[in-house]
Every structure is written in structure tokens, then in C-alpha cells.
């Protein structure tokens, strides 16, 4: 039975004579005579078990003492601490040559735990043994009892275990206390990787390379090792392990995240306080939820504040030109704390009966700088058609409009170009020819550009080729032509005028009066 | 088997001399010192001095100089106390003891029977 | 000189019973001071020595404490050979005894 003594963490005790509670019952040699186990008061006046012997008045003095057996438990190099109280050799009259002040410290190593007798032959000296302080009879009245502390050390070891012994030859002499340990690094955590107990080396100069493990909820970032040293203190520690995502190291353990806060990847960053806008419900967050109405970007890192789309763009002007129109407008109030703020411009053409009833513009329209992703607030569409309504919308957009179910970042105008001069007229039909007259009839041009005013139909005999030529106006889309000569060839041109003018002439429409009162009905360009 | 023996009873007149022997046996003779002690009747113990038997040197307690001599033959192994100029009140039971010296002291582990000296005109 | 003064200077007890002697010094002493035993008409015997250590053939009913000024002699269950005189001593340079306790039957 052994009472608690308290030693370094880095020294594991094979014996400890003082923690022995009755008698040691180590083998002495001779039985009588020799060492002998006495029980005397320690400093704090408990009875302790020590060996002394104190031959001092003959010469040749040789006796032996003999530990039991300890164990190596794997140690290739173990340590004895002897404390020892020597009597002065001047404190004992007239001992003259035969007193000494020293005694030998032996080692035998052996598989067998149960050798009975000391075999003087077997032991191998370890050292001789001196006191730095001895003390006079009468210095013992003080109650300070004055011990001598040495430390030696002995290995390799390589069997199972071995007995220590002490050889007296002529000394006054007690072994107060004898400790055998050897010495490990103790487990450790540095840089987030655990080292076992680990044993030191066979040598005093010898390192043992330890391979670490990362500890719970972390990984390696390069593999952590380190070296053990004879002294059992842990030198040189390499690579390291970083904590997960979701932890943070925290008494050199890799502990989750608070609520309230997170890590996004395995760093040796601590956790931080979520993002404005975004929150975590549960330790060990990789990353922080947004909050309703805010969004995170694909390529947003986790610690950018989640964001909303922008408002709509403000205070939009447009400007038409015919068929131009300049649009202008301000940012929007609220740019939903992204810098990513661009604009799309959509163009819708409506009736002008039922403005509700719009149509894309088509890709006939063109914008500058462009439709889409516009980074300025201003754009020119042109290639409009004229006195025609459209509505143009301008939508505020930033990395998170995808997201947002609710369309309410735009602004719209509806505007109307002015009229311009219409379009020629495609198509122009002889209805009717007669010796006399010619009905015509026409579709509208393609593009009025406004309000068709009138039509002029300009009209001479072919032979004349222009050069005397008749005018007729109608409002009509449709007109008799009379007053020519029979069997004669016409050519017949259309137009349309709008305020803004009159469009371009039709194709010619070729016509030959009849040489009899008959009618001919006629619905090409060349009716003969 | 460790023996201190000692004379018997010793009577002797004021003035004279005796010499109490005390043979060793059963150890080294020279390995122990010896140590002297007086018990007058019905008293305690009272220590008188020792002797290292290997150099023969004496020491002497207070009270027991002078008159008393410690000495030894180490051929065989033994010690005396001489008292001279004996007075009434040296009657006492006079022991030999060996020294047993010990790092945190001494004491005497192996006693002689005792030599009554008897002091009377 | 260190004075030894023991008490009481007699212990009246019965067998079976504990019997605890008492040693005091003039001055602090060592606390391993031997005890001796002397029976009526014999030579002393040492009997502790050390703190606690008792002597050969000496009964572990016989024990010894205490250090500077005070200490102690217990036997634990007197039994009827130990009806004797008990003597402690010190060892400074001048050794002296206390003047002794007589333990008899009750």
C-alpha cells in the first residue's frame, strides 16, 4: 500500500520508499550487523522507514542492501533519487581512517522478481556516492535534519526489471528515502494536436518523434509532430491542426461556436459574430442564416452582411426625339448595402386604345450603352417607331435580385414619339379602268408614324415620263382618276401625309385606259 | 549470541580502589564503544562516560572525573572502570553497556548484569 | 544540561489496560530518543529506538512518538511482564536519563 506523493508530471515513480506504509523488508547482507531498517520522525513529524548503519569503529567494512524488485514499464532509462543524512566522521571520537563519508550505488537487472539473496558479482556500479552536507551528533538536538540529495541515472534497460542496492563501507549513514522513476512526456495538446505519454529515450541525448492526433472537431493543416526529450520536456513542435469549421480553439480544444456566431472554414481564425442581417440558431455554425428580406450572392463570403435588392430607381425624366427617347434617373434611396447596383431597361410598345395590352419593343429597338447591366443612369433607345406609346421600365438590380419574390425595384414612364413622315405605301390596285378612268385603292403605309391627313396620287402618261403630271388628294384610301384619254398608258404614284410631312411615293402602278366602254377590273401595279 | 559479562558484588572500604571487569563476546570487540552507568540503591539511571575500544580514548559525563578511569584489553575483549579513592556514596550497581551508534544517535542496546559496589568502613 | 523529567513517577494500572508515559526535555532534543526498560533486581534493556523502531524481541504493543520538548511511551495493553521502570534518554554531547516511571498493578 502505497500513500500519494505528489511529483512532476514528467516523472512516473517505480518506487518511492517513503510512500510505503510498514516495513520496506529490503534484503540486507550480512542478516545482522549491517543495514537496518529503522522508523524515525520526518520534518512534519511522521515516522518514516529508513536504513541506516553506522560501522564507523572497524575497518573494511562491506554491507550490502538490496531493493526488491521494480518494475521497468517499458522505461529504457530510469532515474534514483536517494535522500540521505550522513554523520560527520570529525563527530565520532577517535574513528581515526576506518570512518568514511561515502557509499556505492549498484543496479542488477533481472527478469526474476524473487531473487532471495544478494549476489555481489551481479551488480554493476552505477557511482560512489558523497554527501554535500554532514551533520555532529549534536546538530540532531536542531530538529532540521539535514538530507543530501543525489540523482543518478542508469540504462539502457532492456529486461523486465531490476534491483538497486547500496553498499556501505564504513560510513554512519541513512537512507532516508530512495525514489525510482523515469521520465516521459507527459500528454500534451500543443497547436491543437495530442500527444500521448510518451517515454524518453534510452540516451540523455536522445529525441523520440512523436506523431500527434488532432484533437476532437479539428484536422491537420500539416502533420504535427514532435520530439520528446531525455528530460521529458517536448522540444520542437511541428505542423499544426486548425478547428473545423463551426469551432474555434478555446483551452486548447476546438469548441463550437457560439450562437451567435460562426466559422466558415478550417482556419485558426476564432468564431465570429454573424454578419449584419443574418443570425445562427445553433453552436457550431459554419455560416449565419439571413434574416427575412435579406439574401446572400453566390459569390458572397460568409462574412459579407446578407443584402437585399436595391428600390426602385428615382426621379426618372425622358426626353423623346421622333423616334428616340433619352431616359435619365437617379439611384435608388436604399441600394440594399451592396455595391453591385447595375440596371435593365424594358421596353414595352401598347396600344394606344388599351395601354395595358403591351408588347416587347422587339429586338428592332436599340440602347446605348446597352439594354442591360447598365452601370450609368442614363440610356439612349432609338429606332423607334413614331407616334406609337411605349413604356419603358428601369429596374434597379444587384447580386440578390434573383432572389427576391417581390418585383419592386423599377420605375416606368410612358411616353409616345412624335410623328414622322409615314412610310411608303407597299401596295397599289387598279380596281376598276374604264376609256376614261381609273379606280384605285391602296393599303395603308406600314408605318404611319402619326395621323394619315391625306393621300396624294400623282398620276401622267407614260410617255410623258414626268414631265407633266397630275395631282389628286384624297383622304380616302381610295380614289377615281378621270378625265384621261382611252387606250393611253398611266403611271400612277402614291403617298401619305402626316403632320410631319409626306412619306415616300409608292412603286409605280402601270395602267392602260380601255378603247371600248367597257370595264376592266384590275389589281396589279401594271394593268393593261 | 551478544554478552556483556560483568563481576560479581565487590565490598570495599572508603578509600580503596576496585576494578569492575566487563567482557565482551559474541561481536568485534573494537566495532562498539562502551559506555558506563551508575544506579545508586533505589535510584535512577546516571551515565558516567564511554570508551572508544578501537583507540581507547575515554569520555567522562560530568560529575565522574578524576576518580573514575575507563580502560581497556582488547586482547580479550574486555573493558574496566577503576574508581579509587572510594567514599560511601560510590555504592551503587555499576553496568557496562555497549554504544550503538546510529546516524540520528546513540544509545546502548546490550547491558552487562550489573557489579554492586559496596562503599563501608 | 539537558534535563529529562518524567511523569508521572508512578502509573498504577491493570493488565489490559493502556499505560501512557511521559518525557519531557529542558530543551528541544531529538525526536528519536531511545526508551529502556528495568525490571526489579536486572540490568536495563533498551527497548525503542529511533522514532518508533523497538528494539529485538521487543512487542509491538510498545510504541514511542513526540518531538522537540514532549514525547511519549504507550503500551497499549499492559500485559504482566511489563510491570518494570521506564527510562528515556538523550544523547546530546552530555547523555543524560529521566529519573524513570514506575508502572505497577493496579
Known amino acids: 500500500v502505497t500513500g500519494s506523493r505528489v511529483y512532476p508530471a514528467n516523472e512516473v515513480t517505480l518506487l518511492d520508499s517513503r510512500s510505503v506504509q510498514g516495513e520496506l523488508g529490503w534484503i540486507a547482507s550480512p542478516l545482522e550487523g549491517g543495514w537496518e531498517e529503522v522508523s524515525i520522525m520526518d520534518e512534519k513529524n511522521t515516522p518514516i522507514r529508513t536504513y541506516q548503519v553506522c560501522n564507523v569503529m572497524e575497518p573494511s567494512q562491506n554491507n550490502w542492501l538490496r531493493t526488491d524488485w521494480i518494475t521497468r514499464e517499458g522505461a529504457q532509462r530510469v532515474y534514483i533519487e536517494i535522500k540521505f543524512t550522513l554523520r560527520d566522521c570529525n563527530s565520532l571520537p577517535g574513528v581515526m581512517g576506518t570512518c568514511k563519508e561515502t557509499f556505492n550505488l549498484y543496479y542488477y537487472e533481472s527478469d526474476n522478481d524473487k531473487e532471495r539473496f544478494i549476489r555481489e558479482n551481479q551488480f554493476v556500479k552505477i557511482d560512489t556516492i558523497a554527501a554535500d552536507e554532514s551533520f555532529t551528533q549534536v546538530d540532531i538536538g536542531d530538529r532540521i535534519m539535514k538530507l543530501n540529495t543525489e540523482i543518478r541515472d542508469v540504462g539502457p534497460l532492456s529486461k523486465k526489471g531490476f534491483y538497486l542496492a547500496f553498499q556501505d563501507v564504513g560510513a554512519c549513514i541513512a537512507l532516508v528515502s530512495v525514489r525510482v522513476f523515469y521520465k516521459k512526456c507527459p500528454l500534451t495538446v500543443r497547436n491543437l494536436a495530442q500527444f500521448p505519454d510518451t517515454i524518453t529515450g534510452a540516451d540523455t541525448s536522445s529525441l523520440v518523434e512523436v506523431r500527434g492526433s488532432c484533437v476532437n472537431n479539428s484536422e491537420e493543416k500539416d502533420v504535427p509532430k514532435m520530439y520528446c526529450g531525455a528530460d521529458g520536456e517536448w522540444l520542437v513542435p511541428i505542423g499544426n491542426c486548425l478547428c473545423n469549421a463551426g469551432h474555434e480553439e478555446r483551452s486548447g480544444e476546438c469548441q463550437a461556436c457560439k450562437i451567435g456566431y460562426y466559422k466558415a472554414l478550417s482556419t485558426d481564425a476564432t468564431c465570429a459574430k454573424c454578419p449584419p442581417h443574418s443570425y445562427s440558431v445553433w453552436e457550431g455554425a459554419t455560416s449565419c442564416t439571413c434574416d427575412r428580406g435579406f439574401f446572400r450572392a453566390d459569390n458572397d463570403a460568409a462574412s459579407m452582411p446578407c443584402t437585399r435588392p436595391p428600390s426602385a430607381p428615382l426621379n426618372l425624366i425622358s426626353n423623346v426625339n421622333e423616334t428616340s427617347v433619352n431616359l435619365e434617373w437617379s439611384s435608388p434611396q436604399n441600394t440594399g448595402g451592396r455595391q453591385d447596383i447595375s440596371y435593365n431597361v424594358v421596353c414595352k410598345k401598347c396600344g394606344a386604345g388599351d395601354p395595358s395590352k403591351c408588347r416587347p419593343c422587339g429586338s428592332g429597338v436599340h440602347y446605348t450603352p446597352q439594354q442591360n447591366g447598365l452601370k450609368t443612369t442614363k440610356v439612349s433607345i432609338t429606332d423607334l417607331l413614331a407616334h406609337t406609346n411605349y413604356t419603358f421600365e428601369i429596374w434597379a438590380v444587384n447580386g440578390v435580385s434573383k432572389y427576391n419574390p417581390n418585383p419592386d425595384q423599377s420605375v416606368s414612364v410612358t411616353v409616345t414619339t412624335n410623328q414622322a413622315a409615314p412610310s411608303s405605301i407597299a401596295l397599289v390596285q387598279a380596281k376598276e379602268v374604264t376609256r376614261y378612268s381609273v379606280a384605285l385603292a391602296w393599303l395603308e403605309p406600314d408605318r404611319p408614324n402619326g395621323v394619315i391627313l391625306e393621300y396624294e396620287v400623282k398620276y401622267y402618261e407614260k410617255d410623258q415620263n414626268e414631265r407633266s403630271y397630275r395631282i389628286v388628294r384624297t383622304a380616302a384610301r381610295n380614289t377615281d382618276i378621270k378625265g384621261l384619254n382611252p387606250l393611253t398608258s398611266y403611271v400612277f404614284h402614291v403617298r401619305a401625309r402626316t403632320a410631319a410631312g409626306y412619306g415616300d411615293f409608292s412603286e409605280p402602278l402601270e395602267v392602260t385606259t380601255n378603247t371600248v366602254p367597257s370595264r376592266i377590273i384590275g389589281d396589279g401595279a401594271n394593268s393593261t | 549470541q551478544v554478552q556483556l559479562l560483568q563481576s560479581g558484588a565487590e565490598v570495599k572500604k572508603p578509600g580503596a580502589s576496585v576494578k569492575v571487569p566487563c567482557k565482551a563476546s559474541?561481536?568485534?570487540?573494537?566495532?562498539?564503544?562502551m559506555s558506563w552507568v551508575r544506579q545508586a540503591p533505589g535510584q535512577g539511571l546516571e551515565w558516567m562516560g564511554w570508551?572508544?575500544?578501537?583507540?581507547?580514548?575515554?569520555t567522562y559525563a560530568q560529575g565522574f572525573t578524576g576518580r573514575f578511569v575507563f580502560s581497556l584489553d582488547t586482547s580479550v575483549s574486555t573493558a574496566y572502570l577503576q574508581i579509587s579513592s572510594l567514599k560511601a556514596e560510590d555504592t551503587a550497581v555499576y553496568y557496562c553497556?555497549?554504544?550503538?551508534?546510529?546516524?540520528?544517535?546513540?544509545?546502548?542496546?546490550?547491558w552487562g548484569q550489573g557489579t554492586l559496589v559496596t562503599v563501608s568502613s | 544540561e539537558i534535563v529529562l523529567t518524567q511523569s508521572p513517577a508512578t502509573l498504577s494500572v491493570s493488565p489490559g489496560e493502556r499505560a501512557t508515559l511521559s518525557c519531557r526535555a529542558s530543551?528541544?532534543?531529538?525526536?528519536?530518543l531511545p526508551w529502556y526498560q528495568q525490571k526489579p533486581g536486572q540490568a536495563p534493556r533498551l527497548l525503542i529506538y529511533?522514532?518508533?523502531t523497538r528494539a529485538t524481541g521487543i512487542p509491538d504493543r510498545f510504541s514511542a512518538s513526540g518531538s522537540g520538548t514532549d514525547f511519549t511511551l504507550t503500551i497499549s495493553r499492559v500485559e504482566p511482564e511489563d510491570f518494570a521502570v521506564y527510562y528515556c534518554?538523550?544523547?546530546?554531547?552530555?547523555?543524560?536519563f529521566g529519573q524513570g516511571t514506575k508502572v505497577e498493578i493496579k
Open positions: 553497556a555497549r554504544v550503538r551508534t546510529t546516524v540520528y544517535g546513540d544509545n546502548m542496546d546490550v
Open positions: 559474541g561481536y568485534t570487540f573494537t566495532s562498539r564503544a
Open positions: 570508551i572508544n575500544t578501537n583507540t581507547g580514548n575515554p
Open positions: 530543551q528541544s532534543v531529538s525526536s528519536n
Open positions: 529511533g522514532a518508533s
Open positions: 534518554q538523550q544523547y546530546g554531547p552530555s547523555w543524560t
